[in-house]
């Protein structure tokens, strides 16, 4: 024990100065008659030690560290011993902060564990061992006068909460509660809470259940859910209000809140939801009108709303087989009448024979948008409905009648863009109730079964834009039929392209006869192609050796042309351009040479 360190304080505020002295006893002077005392903080040598020999022969070194910026470090007093540093003594220094005032102290009463659980935020790190104690006392009034003290509650290390057990609690009586924080640099206390444990009670949530359907009870309406909850029995006598939250299981919808609901509304019909949708539901409750804490949300209940019967208008159209007029092909389209019109599971076409009250004969049941059936000979009308598990749409009557109404006139069609066609007409007199417009590929690809159709409900309409199933370079047949109260007018049809193709190639030029100043050319016209508009004209171009160009426009029926005014013994490049409304294409170039003046004409 040659040396001994003493310090002004082993624990200081972080950044504060610290003074230390190291005394080396005289009996250690064999080390060196005048030993130089060195200081080391951690691994670093510290300059600034002031050394002196005391009257009793001991050596003393005093050092002041101006700022202790380490939260923990060892300060060593050393001597040089040969080539190494010999530590004579060392002390542990700590630096940190006094405890901040604990804040956000809050408590809740758990009736299941019969304890009052209080939690707080300890504040910033002190870097020093800091103890927290939850202190409390019983009070008759509003905590101004202190009654019996309650045993301190000391949390486990590192925890910022503590439980006061039931034996230390008095329900329906106020308690003063606060947190005391303490370390080597000071003590702090949180503001005091004054509370009756029952006023911070946190109840368990009810259990949500689906309501067992009873035979006499009406089933829930579309978009509604019937549910009930089983209150947490131990909290049953506490007046509470509850709230329900729900959201669709699919999608990103946020929770929707419903409340307040009394705990006693043990069964509930929740409406205004999407039909045929799976929902997640939870409930929570709070003591009310007296104070309390919200319970946690209950475990989720998953329920599906009932669907609603389809609310759609069915636009219908039909066609008879030419070989067998009693075989009818019926087409329809559902038009939603509301934003949420209900899921459609399928369609039924049925017929009610006259004189057979109540008897309905199904003719077809399908999920498609058309069906073909044999129409009984006495049937003039069938009914079409859309259905799902909740019921059917209003029946749409389909009347099979002769074409007795007036025809529309001046049916015409024109391209709007490569994927749409405008069809226009002059309405007949009287106005029809509407029109059916059908379109599909024209010859040679025409097919009755592949036609697209649309219903135009406005009888005063004078045209319709076809946007479905229109492709460029295809010939379309468009059929328009006017619809009247109990009949229809004759169908009219027109053919059109939405976009025509330019000629794919121009005819090859052939030299038929040549002279000194002329050349007779001919070509074989290309056969007309479907999807390509007819030729409007040809243009023939020729260029001489001096790069002078000449041209002539010829009508589309031309089969040949004679070039006049050519120079003898001259070279010419000639090509033909075939043009239609959709564009033009050039032929390959024909090169020829006119005859020399002495040469004889070639035929």
């Amino acid at each position: 024990e040659c040396g001994h360190i003493s310090v002004s304080a082993p624990i200081v505020h972080l950044g504060d100065p610290i003074t230390a002295s190291c005394i080396i006893k005289q009996n250690c002077s064999h080390l060196d008659p005048e030993p130089q005392i060195l200081w080391r903080l951690g691994a670093e040598l510290q300059p600034g030690g002031r050394q002196q020999r005391l009257s009793d022969g001991t050596q003393e070194s005093i050092i002041t560290l101006p700022h202790l910026n380490h939260t923990q470090a060892f300060l060593s007093c050393c001597l040089n011993w040969g080539n190494s540093l010999q530590i004579l003594d060392q002390v542990e220094l700590r630096a940190g902060y006094p405890p901040a005032i604990p804040h956000n102290l809050s408590c809740l009463m758990n009736l299941t564990t019969s304890s009052l659980i209080c939690q707080w935020e300890p504040g910033p790190e002190t870097h020093l061992p800091t103890s927290f104690t939850l202190k409390s006392f019983k009070s008759r009034g509003n905590c101004q006068t202190q009654g019996d003290s309650i045993l301190d509650c000391v949390p486990k290390d590192g925890q910022s909460h503590c439980c006061i057990p039931r034996k230390h609690l008095l329900l329906y009586q106020n308690m003063g509660i606060w947190v005391q924080a303490e370390n080597a640099l000071g003590t702090s206390m949180s503001p005091q809470l004054c509370l009756d444990p029952m006023d911070v009670v946190k109840l368990e949530p009810p259990m949500l259940r689906t309501m067992d359907p009873s035979p006499e009870a009406a089933p829930p309406q579309a978009g509604c859910l019937q549910l009930c909850w089983e209150p947490w029995q131990p909290g049953l006598h506490i007046n509470q209000k509850c709230e329900l939250r729900h959201k669709p299981q699919r999608g990103e919808a946020s929770w929707a809140l419903v409340g307040p609901l009394p705990l006693e509304a043990l069964q509930y019909e929740l409406c205004g939801l999407l039909p045929a949708t799976a929902y997640t539901l939870q409930i929570r409750c709070i003591r009310w009108p007296l104070p309390g804490h919200w319970s946690d949300w209950s475990p989720s209940l998953e329920l599906r709303t009932t669907e609603r019967a389809p609310t759609v208008r069915l636009d219908t159209w039909w066609r008879q087989r030419q070989l067998d007029p009693r075989t009818v092909q019926l087409f329809w389209k559902p038009v939603p009448l509301e934003e949420d019109s209900g899921r459609i599971q399928g369609y039924v076409v049925s017929w009610r024979p006259s004189g057979q009250a109540g008897a309905i004969l199904p003719l077809c049941n399908t999920t498609e948008l058309s069906c073909t059936f044999h129409l009984p000979s006495e049937a003039q009308e069938v009914a079409l409905v859309a259905y799902n598990s909740a019921g059917t749409s209003r029946p749409t009557p389909v009347v099979f009648s002769e074409s007795r109404g007036p025809a529309l006139t001046r049916l015409h069609a024109m391209a709007r863009d490569p994927h749409s066609l405008w069809v226009g007409w002059e309405p007949p007199n009287p106005w029809p109730q509407g029109y059916v417009i059908e379109w599909g590929l024209g010859p040679p690809s025409a097919s009755n079964s592949n036609k697209t159709w649309r219903m135009e409900q406005n009888g005063r309409a004078t045209g319709f834009l076809l946007k479905e199933n229109i492709r460029p370079f295809q010939l379309y047949e468009i059929i328009v039929t006017p619809l009247y109260q109990d009949t229809m007018g004759p169908s009219q049809h027109v053919y059109a392209y939405s976009q025509e193709m330019a000629p794919s190639h121009a005819p090859e030029l052939h030299l038929k006869h040549i002279g000194k100043t002329w050349a007779q050319l001919e070509w074989v016209p290309e056969p007309p192609e479907l999807g390509k508009s007819p030729l409007t004209h040809y243009t023939i171009f020729w260029t001489n050796a001096q790069n002078q160009s000449f041209s002539a426009i010829l009508n589309a029926s031309s089969r040949g042309f004679v070039l006049h005014g050519l120079e003898p013994a001259s070279l010419y490049h000639i090509h033909l351009m075939a043009a239609s409304q959709a564009g033009a294409t050039n032929s390959t170039v024909l090169t020829l040479m006119t005859l020399t003046p002495e040469g004889s004409e070639l035929h």
Partner: antibody
Framework: EVQLLESGGGLVQPGGSLRLSCAAS????????MGWVRQAPGKGLEWVSS????????PYADSVKGRFTISRDNSKNTLYLQMNSLRAEDTAVYYC???????????WGQGTLVTVSS | DIQMTQSPSSLSASVGDRVTITCRAS??????LNWYQQKPGKAPKLLIY???NLQNGVPSRFSGSGSGTDFTLTISSLQPEDFATYYC?????????FGGGTKVEIK
């Protein structure tokens, strides 16, 4: 001061009916559960039925289920017990009680005697 | 249903004695146990609720303890006015049940 005053007790033949009433005062009646507890001569206490503050929840002891009906009129601060199909074993002093939030019987009436005998 | 078993069914004691009555539930009831005192010809009176909370106006010689299934009512120093029948009652779940009672008589 809380007061509970029972009435309606008396002698009734087996199979008969009786309606007990309990007039409450001194507290906000509509905020509390209320209940009936009975005590047969020389026997212990037996819980009969309770009713929630708004009357929506009404549990019963198995021995009276289907025969007794508990109800309340919050506008009159009165609790009722309708007793039908009475049996000899229903003979008891019937106490009306105010329940605390944790289900204890906080305040009691003085009781009314119901005797079922032919 | 939760059954409540009280013991003893009766006991004799002298003024100044320390008296202990126990009540056992057939299943856990947390702290939902209440104690009542009844004197002959009178209505019961609440002494202790939620296992250990003394009802207002009840002398501090009465105390309650226990949780779960086993509970105790203690009278630290029996007084002449304490001779009565004592009942426990569980309020954890319906049907609410009373114990059979313990009659405290003068020795």
């Amino acid at each position: 001061e809380v007061q509970l005053l029972e009435s309606g007790g008396g002698l009734v033949q087996p199979g008969g009916s009786l309606r007990l009433s309990c007039a409450a005062s001194g507290f906000t009646f509509s905020l509390y559960w209320m209940g009936w507890v009975r005590q047969a001569p020389g026997k212990g206490l037996e819980w009969v039925s309770s009713i929630s503050s708004s009357g929506g929840v009404t549990p019963y002891a198995d021995s009276v289920k289907g025969r007794f009906t508990i109800s309340r009129d919050n506008s009159k601060n009165t609790l009722y017990l309708q007793m039908n199909s009475l049996r000899a074993e229903d003979t008891a002093v019937y106490y009306c009680a105010k329940l605390g939030e944790l289900g204890f019987f906080q305040e009691w009436g003085q009781g009314t005697l119901v005797t079922v005998s032919s | 249903d939760i059954q409540m078993t009280q013991s003893p069914s009766s006991l004799s004691a002298s003024v100044g004695d320390r008296v202990t009555i126990t009540c056992r539930a057939s299943q856990g009831i947390s702290s939902y146990l209440n104690w009542y005192q009844q004197k002959p010809g009178k209505a019961p009176k609440l002494l202790i609720y939620y296992a250990s909370n003394l009802q207002n106006g009840v002398p501090s010689r009465f105390s309650g303890s226990g949780s779960g299934t086993d509970f105790t009512l203690t009278i630290s120093s029996l007084q002449p006015e304490d001779f009565a029948t004592y009942y426990c009652q569980q309020s954890y779940a319906y049907p609410q049940q009373f114990g059979g009672g313990t009659k405290v008589e003068i020795k």
